[in-house]
Interface confidence: low
């Protein structure tokens, strides 16, 4: 008669334990169009055999209270329901069921759920994915303003997300080593939504150069949760009828990690 070989079980099923560990504090942040790896670690009381386990990733959107399947893997097949979604089978062997999403879009923010099945056990964990976009900012003079000695300066921030942003104007004079926040003659326009869901905003500062000291440094300061620290762009009033003929562009380096990245 035939002997069927079964894998030796070293512990009983009652002693089996399956857990899923997600990102600390249950939140991950990424930048628009970046690749993100959403963490999910499988902790099992036995060595993992990936042919007898299943991983499914779901996403619940911020707007719709509905879950959609993003990726699944079961023993001998895997399927990405979102193009490019992937769980590394090589990493899965050592318990890393993290989901890689290339080119993340704003609408992909939401709650991600990692569900792991090692028969007969099932475990799951959730994490919030936050998608942010850092503003690109520039400072330029409105050439259309033609009143004598009057200049209108524009600080423009574009393609940022989420919507909340803070733009302030400051000045340093040679008389004072400290900056002064300017509140008069400042108008900050409405936030404009772009087709891709990001936002633009422009803040205007009106200056009468005859009343200002040459050498005064003006600064536009942009604060946004995607920025590691506030971004500032300076210009110096050199003489009456100061003109910024070329738009000053600032390449902004901002930290990863997203969040109120203070």
């Amino acid at each position: 008669h035939h002997h069927h070989h079964h894998e030796q079980k070293l512990i009983s099923e009652e002693d089996l334990d399956l857990k899923v560990e997600m990102m600390a504090r249950g939140i991950q942040a990424t930048r628009l169009n970046d690749s993100v790896t959403i963490s999910c670690k499988v902790i099992y009381s036995q060595p993992l055999n990936i042919t007898s386990m299943g991983i499914t990733w779901f996403r619940k959107s911020l707007t719709l209270d509905k879950e959609v399947k993003v990726f699944e893997f079961f023993g001998d097949h895997q399927k990405a329901f979102r193009p490019g979604a992937n769980v590394s089978l090589w990493r899965l062997k050592s318990g890393d069921a993290s989901l890689k999403l290339p080119g993340v879009q704003l609408e992909e923010a939401g709650e991600y759920r990692c569900e792991v099945v090692v028969t007969p056990l099932k475990a799951q964990g959730t994490v919030q994915l936050k998608v942010v976009a850092s503003p690109t900012s520039r400072l330029f003079q409105d050439q259309a303003v033609v009143k004598e000695n009057e200049g209108k300066y524009m600080c423009e921030s574009s393609r940022f997300y989420p919507k909340d942003i803070n733009i302030t104007w400051e000045k340093w004079t040679q008389k004072s080593p400290h900056h002064v926040v300017i509140s008069e003659n400042v108008i900050t326009g409405p936030t404009i939504k772009n087709m891709d869901g990001t936002f633009n905003i422009t803040s205007y500062l009106k200056l009468n150069s005859s009343q200002e000291d040459p050498g005064t440094v003006y600064r536009c300061v942009i604060r946004h949760e995607s920025l590691h620290t506030p971004v500032s762009i300076d210009f110096i009033l050199t003489a009456p009828q100061q003109s910024l003929s070329e738009p000053e562009k600032t390449d902004i380096f901002s930290s990863g990690g997203g969040g109120s990245a203070g």
Epitope: A24, A29, N166, R223, F253, G257, G259, S260, G262
Partner: antibody, heavy 117, light 107 residues
């Protein structure tokens, strides 16, 4: 879970340099900034500076420029802070802190640097 | 630099007391304020971020409030393990700055 493990206490002579390390584990190393804080005996906390862990950027407190250099070895998930031209006022506990979504969410255990002749 | 002025510098209280520590910024820092707890010989522990949000695992008796220039940390009912030094910190602009600390002692 996230862990930041710093190197052990150091005793140095004035004028020497010291390199303190901070090894991170439990998270995607390069997605964060690591900052360093100084706490002199019986004193409050001072921010020294930070390094973006992909090695692309550093931010130093003006007060510590010329005194401190921060580097990162992504292969070992370790951040280093070197203090040069040590003086007695550099005697302090130095902490590395991971800058999470809302600043210093995880801290190393601290490294005591004593400068004494 | 933004100065963070913390008061009181020390405070004696009993288990069960309600305690409030204040922190005043020298200029508007929005809600970009964090609070830390430090026990002797230990690293600071993060309690509060964005002025009023508790980190995971921080007991609900700790609460933060305020915006602009005035901030408070409140411990609603002191427990024996709460006796420590507390620091506030602004992270709206560089250099990041801390309050000098409030030492909370047993009465």
């Amino acid at each position: 879970q996230v862990q930041l493990v710093q190197s052990g206490a150091e005793v140095k002579k004035p004028g020497a340099s010291v390199k303190v390390s901070c090894k991170a584990s439990g998270y995607t190393f390069t997605s964060y900034w690591m900052n360093w804080m100084k706490q002199a005996p019986g004193q409050g906390l001072e921010w020294i500076g930070g390094i973006y862990l992909s090695g692309e950027s550093t931010d130093y407190n003006e007060k510590f420029k010329g005194k401190v250099t921060m580097t990162v070895d992504t292969s070992t998930s370790t951040v280093y802070m070197e203090l040069s031209s040590l003086r007695s006022e550099d005697t302090a506990v130095y902490y590395c802190t991971r800058r999470g979504d809302y600043f210093g969410d995880f801290w190393g255990q601290g490294t005591l640097v004593t400068v004494s002749s | 630099d933004i100065q963070m002025t913390q008061s009181p510098s020390s405070l004696s209280a009993s288990v069960g007391d309600r305690v409030t520590i204040t922190c005043k910024a020298s200029q508007n820092v929005g809600k970009y304020v964090a609070w830390y707890q430090q026990k002797p010989g230990k690293a600071p522990k993060s309690l509060i971020y964005s002025a009023s949000n508790r980190y995971d695992g921080v007991p609900s008796r700790f609460s933060g409030s305020g915006s602009g220039t005035d901030f408070t940390l409140t411990i609603s009912s002191l427990q024996p393990e709460d006796f420590a030094t507390y620091f506030c910190q602004q992270y709206i602009s560089y250099p990041l700055t801390f309050g000098a600390g409030t030492k909370l002692e047993i009465k």
